[in-house]
C-alpha cells in the first residue's frame, strides 16, 4: 500500500513538475527590467528564451521573437537546450511511469518489469529536474553577471556617448517557476526510485509448487500473501492518476488590461 502511494505520489509530483518546466520554458518573464533605483519609465521590458517583450504603460504590449539562431548568445542556446532536454526526458519518463504504475494493469506485466520501469522513469525525472534547475541557474548567473556589468557602466563616465538608457535586468517569474518545477520533478523522481525498491519481488528460499488444473493454470506460493503484488480485491479503491495539468501561455493583445500605470 505504501509503495503504491509513494509511486502514485511520485508520479503526480513529477507531472506537476514537468508541467511547470514546460510553463517556465514558454514564459516570457525570464528576465525583467530592474525598477529599483532606476528612473521611473513608462515602458517595461522583459525577456524570455524565445522572445523579448515591451509593455507600455498604455497597456500596449509588443513581443518580438529571436528569429536568428547564430546571433544568439551561446549561454542562451545552452539554457534552451537544457530546458528542452528536461522536457523531453520528463515526457518520456511520464509515459514510462504510466505503464509502471502499480494501480494500472497492463496485460500480464511482471512485477520486476514494473519495478524496472519505475526505476527508469525515476532516473529520467531526476535528470529532467536537474536539467531544468541547471538551465534556470545558468540563466540566473548570466543575469547577475550582466546586472553588475551594467551597474558598473552606469556609474563610469560614459557621458553623452551612450545613446540608449542602460536597462538592467533582474530575475523574472519564470526563473522561480523553473526552480520550483525542477525541484518537484527531482523529488518525484526520487520518490519513484524509492517506490521501485518496494516493487521488486522478494527473493524466497523455497521453490514454488505448481498445481495444474485442466482449464487454466494458477500458481500458488506457500507462506501467505507476503510476496504478493497481484491485483486482488485490495486494489479496487486505488486511484488511477490522470494528469490534468495545463500550462497557460500569456497572450497579450492591444488594448489590454494594464497591471501598472
Amino acid at each position: 500500500m505504501a509503495v503504491t502511494a509513494c509511486q502514485g505520489l511520485g508520479f503526480v509530483v513529477s507531472l506537476i513538475g514537468i508541467a511547470g518546466i514546460i510553463a517556465a520554458t514558454c514564459m516570457d518573464q525570464w528576465s525583467t527590467q530592474d525598477l529599483y533605483n532606476n528612473p521611473v519609465t513608462a515602458v517595461f521590458n522583459y525577456q524570455g528564451l524565445w522572445r523579448s517583450c515591451v509593455r507600455e504603460s498604455s497597456g500596449f504590449t509588443e513581443c518580438r521573437g529571436y528569429f536568428t539562431l547564430l546571433g544568439l548568445p551561446a549561454m542562451l542556446q545552452a539554457v534552451r537546450a537544457l530546458m528542452i532536454v528536461g522536457i523531453v526526458l520528463g515526457a518520456i519518463g511520464l509515459l514510462v511511469s504510466i505503464f509502471a504504475l502499480k494501480c494500472i494493469r497492463i496485460g500480464s506485466m511482471e512485477d520486476s518489469a514494473k519495478a524496472n520501469m519505475t526505476l527508469t522513469s525515476g532516473i529520467m525525472f531526476i535528470v529532467s529536474g536537474l536539467c531544468a534547475i541547471a538551465g534556470v541557474s545558468v540563466f540566473a548567473n548570466m543575469l547577475v553577471t550582466n546586472f553588475w556589468m551594467s551597474t558598473a557602466n552606469m556609474y563610469t563616465g560614459m557621458g553623452g556617448m551612450v545613446q540608449t538608457v542602460q536597462t538592467r535586468y533582474t530575475f523574472g517569474a519564470a526563473l522561480f517557476v523553473g526552480w520550483v518545477a525542477g525541484g518537484l520533478t527531482l523529488i518525484g523522481g526520487v520518490m519513484m526510485c524509492i517506490a521501485c525498491r518496494g516493487l521488486a519481488p522478494e527473493e524466497t528460499n523455497y521453490k514454488a509448487v505448481s498445481y495444474h488444473a485442466s482449464g487454466h493454470s494458477v500458481a500458488y506460493k506457500p507462506g501467505g500473501f507476503k510476496a504478493s503484488t497481484g491485483f486482488g480485491s485490495n486494489t479496487k479503491n486505488k486511484k488511477i492518476y490522470d494528469g490534468g495539468a495545463r500550462t497557460e501561455d500569456e497572450v497579450q493583445s492591444y488594448p489590454s488590461k494594464h497591471d501598472y500605470v
Epitope: 507600455e56 504603460s57 498604455s58 497597456g59 545613446q163
Partner: antibody
C-alpha cells in the same frame, strides 16, 4: 468614434478645490489610461498625471503630488481630476486625454477652463 | 525631470515650402527593448485641444497627411512638414513618453510668411 466630454468652466477662490470630470465614449473605458494635461493661458502643455480606470492605479507628476487626486468611477464610466489648495497660477485649461500605443495621447477632451481669482 | 527643448520658438514659412522643427531631450528616449524612441509630436490650433501627429518618433497617426514626417533617435528629433499648407498654421509640441513625468517641449509656432 472616440470622444471625451469634460465638465464646464469653473471659477474658484484661492485655497479652494476644483473637481473636473471627463466622460469618455466610443471605447471600453477600463482598457485605456486617462491622463490629465493642463495649459496656462498662452503657455505650453504640462502633464499632471494618469489613472488606470480598470485598476484605479495612478501616477502623478511630483510637482502636483499631494494637491491632485485622480479617480475613476467604473459604474458611470467617468474619470475625475481634483486639484486642491488652488492658487492664481493654477488658472489654466485642463484637458483629459486617452493614452494609447507609444504612450501618446490620441483623443483629447475639449478642455475645462478653471479660473482662480479672489 | 526630462527637459524637452524645442527650436525655433517660431517659424515663418512660405506656402508649399518645407518647415523643420527640432526637439532635443535631456536624456535618450530610445528604449533598448524594442529599439523605439518614445517621442510624440502634437499639433495645436487656437482654441482646440492638441492633435496627435506622430508617435514612436516616426510613426504617423492614421488620418495624418503624409506631408508630416518625424525622424531622429536618442536625444535629437525632427518634425518636418514637406509642403506647408494654410491649415498647418499651429503650435507644434514634442513630448517625452518614456520617463515620468511625461514632459512637453515649449512649443514651436508655425506661421505663413
Amino acid at each position: 468614434q472616440v470622444q471625451l466630454v469634460q465638465s464646464g468652466a469653473e471659477v474658484k477662490k484661492p485655497g479652494s478645490s476644483v473637481k473636473v470630470s471627463c466622460k469618455p465614449s466610443g471605447y471600453a473605458f477600463t482598457n485605456y489610461l486617462i491622463d490629465w494635461v493642463r495649459q496656462a493661458p498662452g503657455q505650453g502643455l504640462e502633464w499632471m498625471g494618469g489613472i488606470n480606470p480598470g485598476s484605479g492605479d495612478t501616477v502623478y507628476n511630483e510637482k502636483f503630488q499631494g494637491r491632485v487626486t485622480l479617480t475613476a468611477d467604473k459604474s458611470s464610466m467617468t474619470a475625475y481630476m481634483e486639484l486642491s489648495s488652488l492658487r492664481s497660477e493654477d488658472t489654466a485649461v485642463y484637458f483629459c486625454a486617452r493614452r494609447v500605443r507609444g504612450n501618446s495621447f490620441d483623443s483629447w477632451g475639449q478642455g475645462t477652463l478653471v479660473t482662480v481669482s479672489s | 525631470d526630462i527637459v524637452m527643448t524645442q527650436s525655433p520658438d517660431s517659424l515663418a514659412v512660405s506656402l508649399g515650402e518645407r518647415a523643420t522643427i527640432n526637439c532635443k531631450s535631456s536624456q535618450s528616449l530610445l528604449n533598448s527593448g524594442n529599439q523605439k524612441n518614445y517621442l510624440t509630436w502634437y499639433q495645436q490650433k487656437p482654441g482646440q485641444p492638441p492633435k496627435l501627429l506622430i508617435y514612436w518618433a516616426s510613426t504617423r497617426e492614421s488620418g495624418v497627411p503624409d506631408r508630416f514626417s518625424g525622424s531622429g533617435s536618442g536625444k535629437d528629433f525632427t518634425l518636418t512638414i514637406s509642403s506647408l499648407q494654410a491649415e498647418d498654421v499651429a503650435v507644434y509640441y514634442c513630448q517625452n513618453n518614456y520617463f515620468y513625468p511625461l514632459t512637453f517641449g515649449g512649443g514651436t509656432k508655425v506661421e505663413i510668411k
